[in-house]
């Protein structure tokens, strides 16, 4: 399964769309910066088998998809860009699911790394809580957009390492 290569391209397209989605000047939002505690350690280890690694990436994309599929998100971002972004994420999710199924027969290890997936879930819970506390303000969404762009960039490094392992 050649997921890392195709996923890396999809990741790049998603990042470009995220970059284009900005609606207000981020310079007005400096005081809204927040530490979401990106679970870096879950993307650092070489302990994962390929299927486990893909399942963690899948969870991150799924949570991002969920976050940007809310009505609050629709009210914030330009609809055409949001739709393209969601379509891109959806395609990545489908590719990953197909890839995981392929890998199951190859590996003896469990399909999912439960602790890592839980860490990603909690990370997105913190993001959602922040948006709620900030009443989904334009600046709060700008901070979240910047955070998601950063997490995508960090996961991209993880994917490239995964590809080198093959």
């Amino acid at each position: 399964c050649d997921l890392p290569q195709t996923h890396s391209l999809g990741n790049r397209r998603a990042l470009i769309l995220l970059a284009q989605m900005g609606r207000i000047s981020p310079f007005s939002c400096l005081k809204d910066r927040h530490d979401f505690g990106f679970p870096q350690e879950e993307f650092d280890g070489n302990q994962f088998q390929k299927a486990q690694a893909i399942s963690v990436l899948h969870e991150m994309i799924q949570q991002t998809f969920n976050l940007f599929s809310t009505k609050d998100s629709s009210a914030t971002w330009e609809q055409s860009l949001l739709e393209k972004f969601s379509t891109e994420l959806n395609q990545q999710l489908n590719d990953m699911e197909a890839c995981v199924i392929q890998e199951v027969g190859v590996e003896e290890t469990p399909l999912m790394n439960v602790d890592s997936i839980l860490a990603v879930k909690k990370y997105f819970q913190r993001i959602t809580l922040y948006l709620t506390e900030k009443k989904y303000s334009p600046c709060a969404w700008e901070v979240v957009r910047a955070e998601i762009m950063r997490s995508f960039s960090l996961s991209k490094i993880f994917q490239e390492r995964l590809r080198r392992k093959e």
Partner: antibody, heavy 121, light 107 residues
């Protein structure tokens, strides 16, 4: 290795124009903002302004608004600081530094080596 | 604009001394404060960010504390290479502003 490399020292006359540069390498240039800081001889640090190289959005300190222009060319990972008409009081060391934008990460963690601008008749 | 006031403006100390520099903001900046060290002829170097986080590669003898309007940089045991000028900088809002600096000299 992350690096910000600035253009060399400049000696200019009052009224002349000038554009100094700051080239970033070893990181994604558009993922960080670039700030400019002035240090006049024997004095402290003064923040001048900042640019987001991804879209060239800028913000200036009121003290420098209209006095300088900050720009960037993301295709060559370079930010610029320019003057259209220099004054003797612009004599200073100018530093560029990278900023993580809205991310929770260290501010101004990497700095250029500085560009000394001397304005004298 | 948010004004940043450092004290003292200069101090003399010996190697091994515990040194404390304070920085006060004209309004609350939560924990959005950075500390830099600058040596003559060199670019500033980030020591502490977000009031208390030690920048990678900076010795653990440097520490930062505070929130709101009052902040402190502490050097637990001054080393010969620590003689320099130290600046605080608020990272809360634009325009970003620096303190006037504290020069740490050899006694």
């Amino acid at each position: 290795e992350v690096q910000l490399v600035q253009s060399g020292a400049e000696v200019k006359k009052p009224g002349e124009s000038l554009k100094i540069s700051c080239k970033g390498s070893g990181y994604s240039f558009t993922s960080y903002w670039i700030g400019w800081v002035r240090q006049m001889p024997g004095k402290g640090l003064e923040w001048m302004g900042i640019i987001d190289p991804s879209d060239s959005d800028t913000a200036y300190s009121p003290s420098f608004q209209g006095q300088v222009t900050i720009s960037a060319d993301k295709s060559i990972s370079t930010a610029y600081l320019q003057w259209s008409s220099l004054k003797a009081s612009d004599t200073a060391m100018y530093y560029c530094a990278r900023h993580p934008g809205l991310n929770w990460a260290p501010d101004f963690d990497y700095w250029g080596q500085g560009t000394l601008v001397t304005v004298s008749s | 604009d948010i004004q940043m006031t450092q004290s003292p403006s200069s101090l003399s100390a010996s190697v091994g001394d515990r040194v404390t520099i304070t920085c006060r903001a004209s309004q609350s900046i939560d924990g959005a404060l950075n500390w830099y060290q600058q040596k003559p002829g060199k670019a500033p170097k980030l020591l502490i960010y977000f009031a208390s986080s030690l920048q990678s590669g900076v010795p653990s003898r440097f520490s930062g504390s505070g929130s709101g309007t009052d902040f402190t940089l502490t050097i637990s045991s001054l080393q010969p290479e620590d003689f320099a000028t130290y600046y605080c900088q608020q990272a809360y809002d634009f325009p970003l502003t620096f303190g006037q600096g504290t020069k740490v000299e050899i006694k």
